[in-house]
Interface confidence: medium
């Protein structure tokens, strides 16, 4: 019996087609992805093949103005039209709190939404009961397939699930649910979830009875053969894990942003053993036409976005200096504003010993592309922020050793004075440079804001200590020459859309007046 699994993950609000790098589509003939194109491909596969499942491994939420405006209603609407068979909860599905998940998505989705390792308690338990499930048994042709969900247990550090959801260890939570499916005589079981490729592989290895793992969170691109676009494969598709009980378990992921549609064919024998698996992600490029009716629907929904981008989010009573003459040479107040917004967006009081889990931000000055003038009645709009942060990136959470941070700050000024983009703006950090010293030895003082303290204060950076830092995904991926961050980071979790982080902060503060306050000094 053959099953075709179509899968997406980490779509992050890319409802419209995008450019090849998943930013705003400029040249339509070279654009990719989007729900209208996805619909065309899914429908053509459904027409050709008998047993097809369309699955999503989480993080539909967060990433473009679509989510900022529609807050998840757009996800439910278009996923319903696409006819998804199941979705796993990702960490970003909790970005607007549990209410922001329940109302727009859980109550509106016509497909099961899954996670076996999220347990509700207190007053939430009855409110959310039945709105998401640990597993679902789906009829496919003449057979049944069990889908069991999972979500990163780091979600409380990455999003806003509140205090009434407990995120358990994935493997511990999955095993009893898989065992239950086995007692129900379900002998074909897919683990669908959002914990990253390393955990996907562990689930394949450790959870008895799981036949296939469809994952997300790490934006992993797998491909067999010559890849069709810029993404470099992390391994073959499917990636085969030998389980502890000797079975071969295919693990798949489909990069991110709706650029690819994962396509996996699984052959089961009569006992439900997987005897073969093969496939590849399908690049959703312009050779696949956008479905005209879905495209028309998208255009109808778009109108509200265009109106939103000119509305006032808040006011500034000071000039927001985002000029390259400032932000690439010294502390600039636009850099301070953005870093403060980044930290504010990551306030998660998860432990009594810590006032917060993260206190530090770094931001490449070259990523700040425009100032905002306060003399326009102080008005700040989404449009203004899109000029400051035009690249459609995310502000991510990483864990780094102090020694790596020191290297990053040395890199920040290794060729100071040439107006290069690597000069770092900061939050929760005090740095002093001595430019008379040779490159690689210019950081003379580096103090960081404590987290394990009731009164935050600045302490000298410790080389062997592990620190959490918020930074643009561009830096986490080694951009602007920050290869040491990419090579030495100990953990990397993708965060929220950059503009959304700053716009939310401005809306919350209502009036802003960021200053240059001595975060970066030269001796």
């Amino acid at each position: 019996w053959e099953l075709t699994i179509l899968h997406t993950n980490d779509v992050h609000s890319r409802l419209e087609q995008t450019s090849e790098d998943s930013s705003k589509c400029v040249n339509a003939s070279r654009c990719m992805g989007g729900v209208a194109r996805l619909f065309t491909k899914v429908q053509s596969i459904r027409a050709e093949e008998p047993n097809v499942l369309l699955l999503d491994a989480g993080d539909q939420y967060q990433g473009t103005i679509w989510f900022t405006v529609y807050k998840g209603a757009e996800v439910a609407h278009f996923m319903n039209i696409l006819g998804y068979d199941a979705m796993a909860l990702g960490n970003h599905e909790f970005d607007n709190g549990v209410e922001g998940l329940i109302e727009p998505l859980l109550k509106e989705a016509k497909f099961p939404i899954l996670s076996a390792n999220i347990k509700a308690k207190g007053p939430l338990a009855s409110q959310i009961s039945g709105l998401y499930l640990p597993y679902k048994v789906l009829p496919v042709g003449d057979e049944v397939v069990g889908i069991v969900g999972y979500t990163s247990k780091e979600t409380p550090f990455l999003s806003n699930p509140g205090t009434n959801l407990v995120f358990e260890d994935e493997i511990t939570a999955l095993q009893p649910e898989v065992d239950k499916l086995k007692t129900l005589n379900v002998n074909k079981i897919i683990a669908l979830g959002h914990s990253g490729f390393e955990m996907d592989k562990l689930i394949a290895q450790k959870v008895r009875g799981v036949d296939v793992v469809v994952g997300g969170h790490s934006n992993t691109f797998l491909y067999t053969g010559n890849p069709p676009s810029k993404e470099v494969p992390a391994g073959k598709y499917p990636f085969i894990v030998t389980s502890d009980d000797g079975r071969k378990v295919p693990v798949v992921q489909a990069y991110a942003f709706g650029k690819y549609l994962g396509y996996l064919k699984i052959e089961f024998d009569e006992r439900g053993n997987v005897i073969s698996s093969h496939g590849n992600p399908i690049l959703l490029n312009s050779s696949i036409p956008e479905d005209p009716s879905i495209k028309a629907d998208i255009n109808k929904w778009r109108i509200k976005l265009d109106n939103y981008s000119t509305q006032e989010l808040g006011k500034t009573i000071v000039y927001l200096d985002g000029s390259s003459q400032s932000c690439r040479f010294r502390e600039c107040n636009m850099g301070n504003l953005i870093c403060d917004a980044m930290i504010n967006n990551n306030l998660r009081h998860t432990d009594e010993m810590f006032w917060n889990h993260v206190s530090m931000c770094i931001l490449n000055g070259g990523g700040i592309r425009s100032p905002i003038d306060e003399r326009n009645n102080g008005t700040i709009t989404w449009e203004n922020l899109a000029a400051v942060l035009p690249f459609g990136g995310t502000f991510d959470l990483v864990q780094l050793k102090g020694s790596t941070l020191k290297k990053a700050f040395e890199h920040s000024v290794h060729r100071y004075g040439q107006s290069t983009g690597e000069f770092l703006q900061v939050g929760g950090i005090h740095v002093v440079y001595d430019l008379s010293r040779k490159p690689g030895d210019r950081v003379v003082k580096l103090d960081v804001l404590c987290t394990k303290c009731r009164v935050p204060s600045y302490d000298p950076l410790k080389m062997d200590e592990v620190y959490k830092v918020i930074l643009p995904n561009f830096l986490a991926n080694g951009g602007d020459g920050f290869q040491m961050i990419k090579d030495e980071l100990l953990r990397h979790d993708s965060g929220d859309q950059d503009i959304n982080v700053v716009s939310t902060y401005i809306s919350k503060m209502k009036v802003i007046y960021p200053a240059v306050e001595g975060r970066i000094k030269f001796s």
């Epitope: 067999t224 053969g225 085969i240 000797g246 071969k248 064919k265 052959e267 024998d269 053993n273 997987v274 005897i275 073969s276 698996s277 093969h278």
Partner: antibody
């Protein structure tokens, strides 16, 4: 329906070489290894090796390394086995075989066999 | 390489008999064992894989069992069309066949 159609019988002289073909149909050719098996008259089966049509990668039983060379032509969905420096020991029926699935070498699909006779 | 040794080499049977063939591996092969049937002038046919799983369409009078080094193949009630040579095969490490057991009519 999966089918493997092999080329006809061969009578060859010692020292010569021969190329046996196996035309596959009814499945995604590139997704499954093609195996070759030797059966000498009245004897057991000997696995020769396999080729992965996707990338042309191959694996051989050490006994047949240097004796057999496996190739594929993806465009015609045909696998080939070339046998060189033939001796009477190489006289046998040669089968191409595809696994049930692509994980394990359980040969659910076999060609009809090609008889190779080496004789002066 | 792993050697698969079948017992017996020949078996004289009558219709209706219960027949058992064993195959011993020279080292553990987990349950990575298959059994094949070959009739004269035909290609082999897959009967059992994973030591005990019957292949699609194989009658339930054919069963297999075993794990590690000792494997058993049984025909519960022999029928005339079952007269053939039966081979065991392992693919735990590389791939080897046993020498075969020939079922003949008494």
């Amino acid at each position: 329906e999966v089918q493997l159609q092999q080329s006809g019988p061969e009578l060859v002289k010692p020292g010569a070489s021969v190329k046996v073909s196996c035309k596959a149909s009814g499945y995604a050719f590139a997704s499954y290894n093609m195996n070759w098996v030797k059966q000498s008259h009245g004897k057991s089966l000997d696995w020769i090796g396999y080729i992965d049509p996707y990338n042309g990668g191959s694996s051989y039983n050490l006994t047949f390394k240097g004796k057999a060379t496996l190739t594929v032509d993806k465009s015609s969905t045909t696998a080939y086995m070339h046998l060189n420096s033939l001796t009477s020991e190489d006289s046998a029926v040669y089968y191409c075989a595809r696994g049930y699935g692509n994980y394990k070498a359980w040969f659910a699909y076999w060609g009809q066999g090609t008889l190779v006779t080496v004789s002066a | 390489s792993i050697v698969m040794t079948p017992t017996p080499k020949f078996l004289l049977v009558s219709a209706g008999d219960r027949v058992t063939i064993t195959c011993k591996a020279s080292q553990s092969v987990s349950n990575d064992v298959a059994w094949y049937q070959q009739k004269p002038g035909q290609s082999p046919k897959l009967l059992i894989y994973y030591a005990s799983t019957r292949y699609t369409g194989v009658p339930d009078r054919f069963t297999g069992s075993g794990y590690g080094t000792d494997f058993t193949f049984t025909i519960s009630t022999v029928q005339a069309e079952d007269l053939a040579v039966y081979f065991c095969q392992q693919d735990y490490s590389s791939l080897t066949f046993g020498a075969g057991t020939k079922l003949e009519l008494k």
